[in-house]
C-alpha cells in the first residue's frame, strides 16, 4: 500500500530458472521411403537451450526438414505459388515468403503441380501444419525452479525469493503454498486460464510476473514475492502477424563432402519472467 | 505530457521478434589448394540466432577458419609478434592477442616470416580484415515483425502494439505509416541517419526505442507506441576497444577420428529493443 | 545526491561484452578403455556462448557424458535407485530424478548393483561431483570489456562509459582506474569479496552493477558510471534447490546410423550487468 | 515372429580365424544390446562380448585382444571376428539381442546356435 511519507525505490533484479522433466515422443519417421514408428525421450538438452536469466524456451512441438543441401529445386506449391510456364518465374526474384532466389525457370514440383526453380536449401521445407496434438504435449508436468534475487541499492538491501527455511520438493499453488518457487507448467498455464495442450501446438509466451512490495522499515518490515501469470503473445492473432511462437534453428553436417542441414521449426512456450516492484523507507 | 495529478507507472514490456528474408552470397572458396567462386544462399536459420526478446541478432559478415585441430603452429605474424630466435618465446606464455599456449620455440610461419609456436586450435585464425563489401550486404531488405505486450500491474492495464485492425503486409514509414509494426532493416538505419551498407562490414549495434506515453483516464484515454532509432555502438571508437559487433563461435565435428572445428566470426547488427514509457490515472 | 528541484528520469541502457583469454585445460580422457592424460586448448569459442548484452556466461568447470544413444539401458544407482527385483520397477514411470522411462524391469548396472532398465539417452548420465580443482580454473585471468549506451530520453542525453581519452589496454581498479571498462574476472570476484577458484567449481552468478547519478544541468554537469559487484546466487543453498550454475547442453552426430550425442554440463558463471540510476535536469 | 538367424560357424585350426554373423528378422521397433555367448560340452553359457546400440563394447577376459563384436544398425546385424582361435574356444556360440517390440516392450531373443571347433 502507499505510504506517502516514504522514499520509494524501484527493484534491480536477478533471475535463474532450471527446468527438469522428460518427454516421450512418438511420431513416424520416414527412412529410405519407409515409414515407420520412432519413439524417443527428450530431456532438458534436446527442448530447452541455454538462455538468459529472464527468459526460459521449453520446445513443445517441431517439424523437421532433414537432409537439405544448397542446390535447385522447385519452390513448395503454396497458395498463389504454382506456374504454368517460365513467364511467370523472374530470374534472380526473392519472394519474402519463399526460401530461395527463382532461376526464371517452372518446373514441376510432383505429377500434378509446377512451381518456380529456385536456388535454395533443397528440397524446400514444406509449409505443413504444426503436428496435433503436440509432440511434447508432457512437458505441461514438467517443473520449472524460479530463483530471484533482488536488490534496491538506495536503501543497500538485497534479499531473495528463496529462504532457507523452503523446503525443496514443494510445488506451487497459489493457495497453499505460494511462497513455493518450483513451478509445474501445466498449473502456470491453469492459473493464466489457458490450456496448455492447445498453446503446445503453436506455441506461445507464457508471462510470470514476480512483484515485490517491500516495505523496509524496521518497524513494519515486509518483502516477499507475489507471483502471477499472464498470457503475452495474442491467441487471436490474424495469420500474417505469425501466431504463436516458434523458431528456426538447424543441424549442419558433411555427407559424401557435400554440406548439408537439418532444418528445424521449433514451436514451444517463451516463459518471460517479469520482475517489478519498489522497496520504501522512512 | 506531463498531467502532475496523474499516479504515473513504469512500463511492463514483452516483445517477440521475427526476421524474415534471404540473402545470397558469392564468395572464394578455396578446397584443395583451388580458389573457385562458392554461391550460397542463406535463410533466417542461417544467419539469425534463436535469442531473447529484447535483442535480436542478424549476421551481416563473416570470416571462416575451417579444419582447425588441437596441435602445435606458428602463431599468426600480426605487429609485433614475429621472431628470429627461440629467445623472444617463453614457454607457457598466453599473449593475451594470440591465441594459443607458446612453447618456447620460434618456427617458420611462411616462406618469409618466423613466429612463436604455440599450442593451439592450428592453423590459427588469420587476423584478415572482414570482407568489403559485406557478404550479407543483401540484408538491408530483409523485414522483421517486433510485437510488444505491455503491462501497467497498478493501473490493470494491458495492450498490445499489434491491433487487430492492422495489416500484415505494412511497412512501417514515420510519416505514412507509423502504427505498422513491421520494419525494414535498411529503413531502421537511415531513420537513424547510418549508412547499412557500411556499418554491415564490421557490425554494431543498432536501438529500436518503443516509447509508450499512455493516458489511462477514461475522458482522454490514449496508448499506443511511438517507435524512434538510434545506433548504439560507438562508430569512432579506438581500435583497441574492439569497433562494431562481432562474435566467434564454432561447428565441431569428427573426421578420422580427430575432433577438429570450424570457428566463424560473425559480424553483425545486433537490434536492441527499448521499451519505456509511463501511464498515468487519477 | 537528491536535488529535489531536478526532474528525475531512469537510465534506458544498452549493454555490450567481449570476453579474451584462453585456458589450458588438462583432464583424464577415456578411449577405447584406455585411460590417458587429455591437454586441450579453450578460447572464447569454446568457453562462452553468443549471449544477450545484459549476460554473458563464462564456462569454467564441464562433465561431459559422451556417445549416448535412445535404447535402454540400467539407470544410474544414485541413492535410493537401487532394485532387488522386477517389482520395485513400474513400466511407464518417470521419475523425476531420474532420465528416462521404465521399462518394469530391474538389470544389473555393474557387478554389484542392479537398476531399473529405462528407454533413455545411454550410458544415462552419472551423476558424478564437478572436478575440483575445475578445468578452467585460468579463467580467473580472463579479461572482459563492457561497453556501455545509455540515453534520457526525456532529457535527450546519451553518453557511454568508454571515452575517447580511455585507453584500450588498462585495467579496472577500484582505486587507481575506476573508468576503465576492462575488468579481471578474478578482480571482479576479489572486490566481490568471493573466491573465484571456489566457485569456479560448482558455478555461480556474479552481479556487475553500473550505477549512473547523473547531473545534467550545464552549471554543475556531472555523468560518469560507478561500478559495483556481488554476488547473486546464494553460496549456503540447499542442495535440493541446485547451488551454483550450470545447464546441459548437446552436440548430435550420427555414427552407424544411429543419431548420438555427446552431452555437457556446462558449470560456469554467468555474469549479469545491473544499470541503473536517474538523470536529473533542472 | 522375431527370428536371430545366425551363421558363420565351422572348424578350424588352431591360430585361424571365423567370422560369425547374426541378423534379427521380422517386425519389431527397435534392437538394443546385442550379445555372443557360448556353451562349450558340460559347461554352463558365458558371455563373450556384447555391444550397445551406441557401440560400445565389453569382453570376456579369456577373448580380450583377440576377438572384435561389431554391429550394422541399418541390417540389424551382429558380428563377431574371432582370430587367434584356440582349442578352448570350442563351443556352441549363441547370439542374443534385447528386441523392442513395440515401445518399452523389450524382449530376449536368442539364436539357435552356431558350432564352432578349433583343432589343434
Known amino acids: 500500500s502507499d505510504k506517502l511519507y516514504q522514499r520509494k525505490e524501484p527493484v534491480i533484479s536477478s533471475v535463474h530458472t532450471k527446468v527438469k522433466g522428460i518427454a516421450e515422443v512418438t511420431e513416424n519417421v520416414t527412412e529410405g521411403g519407409v515409414t515407420k514408428l520412432g519413439h524417443s525421450i527428450f530431456d532438458t538438452a534436446d527442448y530447452t537451450f541455454p538462455l538468459q536469466g529472464n527468459s526460459f524456451f521449453v520446445m513443445t512441438n517441431y517439424v523437421k526438414s532433414e537432409g537439405q543441401v544448397q542446390t535447385l529445386c522447385p519452390e513448395y506449391p503454396r497458395r498463389g505459388a504454382q506456374c504454368s510456364s517460365d513467364r511467370r518465374c523472374k530470374k534472380g526474384w526473392m519472394d519474402p515468403q519463399s526460401k530461395g532466389i527463382q532461376t526464371g525457370r517452372c518446373v514441376p514440383y510432383d505429377k500434378t503441380r509446377k512451381t518456380c526453380e529456385v536456388s535454395a536449401w533443397c528440397p524446400t521445407e514444406e509449409e505443413k501444419e504444426a503436428p496435433r496434438p503436440a509432440l511434447l504435449r508432457s512437458a505441461e508436468n514438467f517443473t520449472v525452479l524460479i530463483k530471484n534475487n533482488i536488490h534496491f541499492p538506495g536503501h543497500n538491501y538485497t534479499t531473495r525469493n528463496i529462504l532457507p527455511t523452503m523446503n525443496g520438493s514443494c510445488t506451487f499453488h497459489k493457495t497453499w503454498d505460494p511462497q513455493c518457487s518450483i513451478f509445474r507448467l501445466g498449473d502456470i498455464f491453469q492459473e493464466a486460464g489457458e490450456n496448455f495442450t492447445e498453446v503446445a501446438v503453436q506455441g506461445g509466451i507464457m508471462g510470470i510476473e514476480i512483484y515485490w512490495d517491500c516495505n523496509l522499515d524496521s518497524w513494519s518490515h515486509h518483502c516477499r514475492p507475489r507471483y502471477s501469470f499472464r498470457r503475452l503473445d495474442d491467441k487471436n492473432m490474424d495469420e500474417s502477424f505469425v501466431p504463436g511462437y516458434n523458431f528456426r534453428y538447424a543441424k549442419y553436417y558433411k555427407e559424401n563432402n557435400v554440406e548439408k542441414r537439418t532444418l528445424i521449426k521449433a514451436f514451444g512456450i517463451r516463459f518471460d519472467i517479469l520482475v517489478f516492484g519498489t522497496g520504501g523507507k522512512f | 505530457s506531463d498531467k502532475l495529478y496523474q499516479r504515473k507507472e513504469p512500463v511492463i514490456s514483452s516483445v517477440h521478434t521475427k526476421v524474415k528474408g534471404i540473402a545470397e552470397v558469392t564468395e572464394n572458396v578455396t578446397e584443395g589448394g583451388v580458389t573457385k567462386l562458392g554461391h550460397s544462399i542463406f535463410d533466417t536459420a542461417d544467419y539469425t540466432f534463436p535469442l531473447q526478446g529484447n535483442s535480436f541478432f542478424v549476421m551481416t559478415n563473416y570470416v571462416k577458419s575451417e579444419g582447425q585441430v588441437q596441435t602445435l603452429c606458428p602463431e599468426y605474424p600480426r605487429r609485433g609478434a614475429q621472431c628470429s630466435s627461440d629467445r623472444r618465446c617463453k614457454k607457457g606464455w598466453m599473449d593475451p592477442q594470440s591465441k594459443g599456449i607458446q612453447t618456447g620455440r620460434c618456427v617458420p610461419y611462411d616462406k618469409t616470416r618466423k613466429t612463436c609456436e604455440v599450442s593451439a586450435w592450428c592453423p590459427t585464425e588469420e587476423e584478415k580484415e572482414a570482407p568489403r563489401p559485406a557478404l550479407l550486404r543483401s540484408a538491408e531488405n530483409f523485414t522483421v515483425l517486433i510485437k510488444n505486450n505491455i503491462h501497467f500491474p497498478g493501473h490493470n492495464y494491458t495492450t498490445r502494439n499489434i491491433l487487430p485492425t492492422m495489416n500484415g503486409s505494412c511497412t512501417f514509414h514515420k510519416t505514412w505509416d507509423p502504427q505498422c509494426s513491421i520494419f525494414r532493416l535498411g529503413d531502421i538505419f537511415q531513420e537513424a541517419g547510418e549508412n547499412f551498407t557500411e556499418v554491415a562490414v564490421q557490425g554494431g549495434i543498432m536501438g529500436i526505442e518503443i516509447y509508450w506515453d499512455c493516458n489511462l483516464d477514461s475522458w482522454s484515454h490514449h496508448c499506443r507506441p511511438r517507435y524512434s532509432f538510434r545506433r548504439l555502438d560507438d562508430k569512432n571508437m579506438d581500435e583497441s576497444f574492439v569497433p562494431g559487433y562481432n562474435f566467434r563461435y564454432a561447428k565441431y565435428y569428427k573426421e578420422n577420428n580427430v575432433e577438429k572445428r570450424t570457428l566463424i566470426k560473425a559480424f553483425g547488427i545486433r537490434f536492441d529493443i527499448l521499451v519505456f514509457g509511463t501511464g498515468g490515472k487519477f | 545526491s537528491d536535488k529535489l528541484y531536478q526532474r528525475k528520469e531512469p537510465v534506458i541502457s544498452s549493454v555490450h561484452t567481449k570476453v579474451k583469454g584462453i585456458a589450458e585445460v588438462t583432464e583424464n580422457v577415456t578411449e577405447g578403455g584406455v585411460t590417458k592424460l587429455g591437454h586441450s586448448i579453450f578460447d572464447t569459442a569454446d568457453y562462452t556462448f553468443p549471449l544477450q548484452g545484459n549476460s554473458f556466461f563464462v564456462m569454467t568447470n564441464y562433465v561431459k557424458s559422451e556417445g549416448q544413444v535412445q535404447t535402454l539401458c540400467p539407470e544410474y544407482p544414485r541413492r535410493g535407485a537401487q532394485c532387488s527385483s522386477d517389482r520395485r520397477c513400474k513400466k511407464g514411470w518417470m521419475d523425476p530424478q531420474s532420465k528416462g522411462i521404465q521399462t518394469g524391469r530391474c538389470v544389473p548396472y555393474d557387478k554389484t548393483r542392479k537398476t531399473c532398465e529405462v528407454s533413455a539417452w545411454c550410458p544415462t548420465e552419472e551423476e558424478k561431483e564437478a572436478p575440483r580443482p575445475a578445468l578452467l580454473r585460468s579463467a580467473e585471468n580472463f579479461t572482459v570489456l563492457i561497453k556501455n549506451n545509455i540515453h534520457f530520453p526525456g532529457h535527450n542525453y546519451t553518453t557511454r562509459n568508454i571515452l575517447p581519452t580511455m585507453n584500450g589496454s588498462c585495467t579496472f581498479h577500484k582505486t587507481w582506474d575506476p573508468q576503465c571498462s576492462i575488468f579481471r574476472l578474478g578482480d571482479i570476484f576479489q572486490e566481490a569479496g568471493e573466491n573465484f577458484t571456489e566457485v569456479a567449481v560448482q558455478g555461480g552468478i556474479m552481479g556487475i552493477e553500473i550505477y549512473w547519478d547523473c547531473n545534467l544541468d550545464s552549471w554543475s554537469h556531472h555523468c560518469r558510471p560507478r561500478y559495483s559487484f556481488r554476488r547473486l546466487d546464494d553460496k549456503n543453498m540447499d542442495e535440493s534447490f541446485v547451488p551454483g550454475y550450470n545447464f546441459r547442453y548437446a552436440k548430435y552426430y550420427k555414427e552407424n546410423n544411429v543419431e548420438k550425442r555427446t552431452l555437457i554440463k556446462a558449470f560456469g558463471i554467468r555474469f549479469d550487468i545491473l544499470v541503473f540510476g536517474t538523470g536529473g535536469k533542472f | 515372429e522375431v527370428q536371430l538367424v545366425e551363421s558363420g560357424g565351422g572348424l578350424v585350426q588352431a591360430g585361424g580365424s571365423l567370422r560369425l554373423s547374426c541378423a534379427a528378422s521380422?517386425?519389431?521397433?527397435?534392437?538394443?544390446?546385442m550379445a555372443w555367448y557360448r556353451q562349450a560340452p558340460g559347461k554352463q553359457r558365458e558371455l563373450v562380448a556384447d555391444?550397445?546400440?551406441?557401440?560400445?563394447?565389453n569382453y570376456a577376459d579369456s577373448v580380450n585382444g583377440r576377438f572384435t563384436i561389431s554391429r550394422d544398425n541399418v541390417r540389424n546385424t551382429v558380428y563377431l571376428q574371432m582370430d587367434g582361435l584356440k582349442p578352448e574356444d570350442t563351443a556352441v556360440y549363441y547370439c542374443?539381442?534385447?528386441?523392442?517390440?513395440?515401445?518399452?516392450?523389450?524382449?530376449?531373443?536368442w539364436g539357435q546356435g552356431t558350432q564352432v571347433t578349433v583343432s589343434s
Open positions: 521380422g517386425s519389431f521397433f527397435r534392437v538394443n544390446n
Open positions: 555391444i550397445t546400440r551406441g557401440d560400445r563394447t
Open positions: 542374443y539381442a534385447r528386441i523392442e517390440l513395440g515401445v518399452l516392450v523389450p524382449r530376449d531373443y
